[in-house]
Amino acid sequence: SGVFQLQLQEFINERGVLASGRPCEPGCRTFFRVCLKHFQAVVSPGPCTFGTVSTPVLGTNSFAVRDDSSGGGRNPLQLPFNFTWPGTFSLIIEAWHAPGDDLRPEALPPDALISKIAIQGSLAVGQNWLLDEQTSTLTRLRYSYRVICSDNYYGDNCSRLCKKRNDHFGHYVCQPDGNLSCLPGWTGEYCQQPICLSGCHEQNGYCSKPAECLCRPGWQGRLCNECIPHNGCRHGTCSTPWQCTCDEGWGGLFCDQDLNYCTHHSPCKNGATCSNSGQRSYTCTCRPGYTGVDCELELSECDSNPCRNGGSCKDQEDGYHCLCPPGYYGLHCEHSTLSCADSPCFNGGSCRERNQGANYACECPPNFTGSNCEKKVDRCTSNPCANGGQCLNRGPSRMCRCRPGFTGTYCELHVSDCARNPCAHGGTCHDLENGLMCTCPAGFSGRRCEVRTSIDACASSPCFNRATCYTDLSTDTFVCNCPYGFVGSRCEFPVGLPPSFPW
């Protein structure tokens, strides 16, 4: 659809005569009839297939024609067409004399014709005005013409319909050739697809308007490139949604079981070496001079009573020194210069000679010990505390301070491993000598019944349109991750697609 525009510029009829040679009375009151038709190899009479138009009387004899387009007038003349512009045409322009006011063809005598031109033309759409001049012996007509497309029509022959829009069906303007030019932030054949925030993950993110990034279920972050781990996951990560892959040193379904107490809590003091020995369990190996479960106690080297035979111990920077009583010598006062005659046995100990009296041995009463019965018995020396318990002297008695997980006088009893309810998903816990065992209900397995074996919400393929299914282990449900163009809890609904010609 377009318009053939004809601009009449000047008509010269100096002698004021008709085509027959007869003069007009009083002058030639001139108007024009225009016929536009298909291109003919030889211009021939026939219907004006592309349209006709007539002007009012524009002047007498010779005159210039005013450009009247701005005032809504009739110059240029408009010949609209509703077909593909063929590029060639035949144009006939007749100049007529109007003796009266009635300009209808049937009201005029046939000899009222002043002049007639008929040309074959070639004209592309949107070309600049093409100027032409036709001269005869009596008249001259100067005119120009062009073809423009109607509103919303584009292309070389005005055949492409394009209507700019900014709504659900598209966001575009039209290029001169009729192709769509998407508004900023939109893409696709009809510019219906928003361009999401730069970097927004292609599969895991989407948008309903430009520069947006909305995450599909199971994804988060500004660009929807971070998966959401399993609900309750404490010390774990994911590579796909609802996973809980434990960080190093953590275990369990929710990665909340500490398998590396040493690293996470550094319980051993004074430079001791820490060794993990199970969940929340560890052993400290103390450096010399330290003791205690966590090596928190500084140990005096004299505390072990290294001096024998009543020698007194003195702490030194680099160890200790024994001050021996008379009759003894050696690093620990272990060598005697005494015999039974010297009554060396204290605390009621009996003396027995050895090696023909060159040496002796004391037999000590209960509660005393030492080569001279000089020491009260230390009830802790026999390490009576089991499972790494710490022995403490309390006057005549002793007691054991147990490590976590043990109890009893000598720390010989395990605290029940089952007390913490370690079995997941309703598993039954059994205490064993060195640990525990879980008996799992149907559908679960693993040391702690943490592995789901048979109940899989995704097993029935509930998601449509090639969506990805994820099982939410905490709720026994599934989540569908929809591909582009589908919505709904099962991705069953297509997003409304445009008809092929949305306008």
């Epitope: 003919q40 190899a41 030889v42 211009v43 021939s44 009479p45 026939g46 060639t88 035949s90 006939i92 007639k116 031109i117 008929a118 040309i119 074959q120 033309g121 070639s122 032409d132 036709q134 001269t135 005869s136 012996t137």
Partner: antibody
């Protein structure tokens, strides 16, 4: 008096060129589309080429396309036909004509003979 | 291309006879057809254009009719000067095409 006078014909060997001219008088040459029409000895009429009044449109019959060129000089009221790579089958009397039946115009020249022979 | 089939190719008639020559186009050419008369050694002369319009100066015994694809030239009463070859020409589309001609001879 309207006149169209062709010139430039003659005998020429195959593959050679000729340029025909048509001088117009007695009418406004620049107003009309012009045609070259030929007639082989003892045969019917055959259209050859066309040029519009302003020279913007040209058409040729398939057998001469790429070999013949029609042109016009409105200031000299003259029509031309440049014929290259001539063939024996181009032998004919060549007429120029101004045809515009809408205006009742039908002017023909008497023709010029072109003979292509080795 | 539009083919123009003219018949008959030759015709013998006498002065005073009514003669009809036909031309058929291979596709619709509306009324864009002309009839020409040609005498030996002369340029063709236009008789009828736009299928039925008589060219100025042509005797009224010549008439044309038809539109679309079928056209007729009629000479109502043959005169001695009418013995010649007659051609139809379609002016609708390029290439312009002529009928093969009808040679009208004296019987």
């Amino acid at each position: 008096e309207v006149q169209l006078v062709e010139s430039g014909g003659g005998v020429v060997q195959p593959g050679r060129s000729l340029r025909l001219s048509c001088a117009a008088s007695g009418f406004t040459f620049s107003n009309y589309g012009m045609y070259w029409i030929r007639q082989a000895p003892g045969k019917g009429l055959e259209w050859v080429a066309f040029i519009s009044h302003g020279g913007g449109i040209t058409y040729y019959r398939d057998s001469v396309k790429g070999r013949f060129t029609i042109s016009r000089d409105n200031s000299k009221s003259t029509l031309y036909l440049q014929m290259n790579s001539l063939r024996a089958e181009d032998t004919a009397v060549y007429h120029c004509a101004a045809l515009n039946w809408e205006l009742g115009i039908d002017y023909w020249g008497q023709g010029t003979m072109v003979t292509v022979s080795s | 291309d539009i083919q123009m089939t003219q018949s008959p190719s030759s015709l013998s008639a006498s002065v005073g006879d009514r003669v009809t020559i036909t031309c058929r186009a291979s596709e619709d050419i509306y009324s864009n057809l002309a009839w020409y008369q040609q005498k030996p050694g002369k340029a063709p002369k236009l008789l009828i254009y736009a299928a039925n319009r008589l060219q100025d100066g042509v005797p009224s015994r010549f008439s044309g009719s038809g539109s679309g694809t079928d056209f007729t030239l009629t000479i109502s009463s043959l005169q001695p000067e009418d013995f010649a070859t007659y051609y139809c020409l379609q002016g609708s589309k390029f290439p312009l095409t002529f009928g093969q001609g009808t040679k009208l001879e004296i019987k």
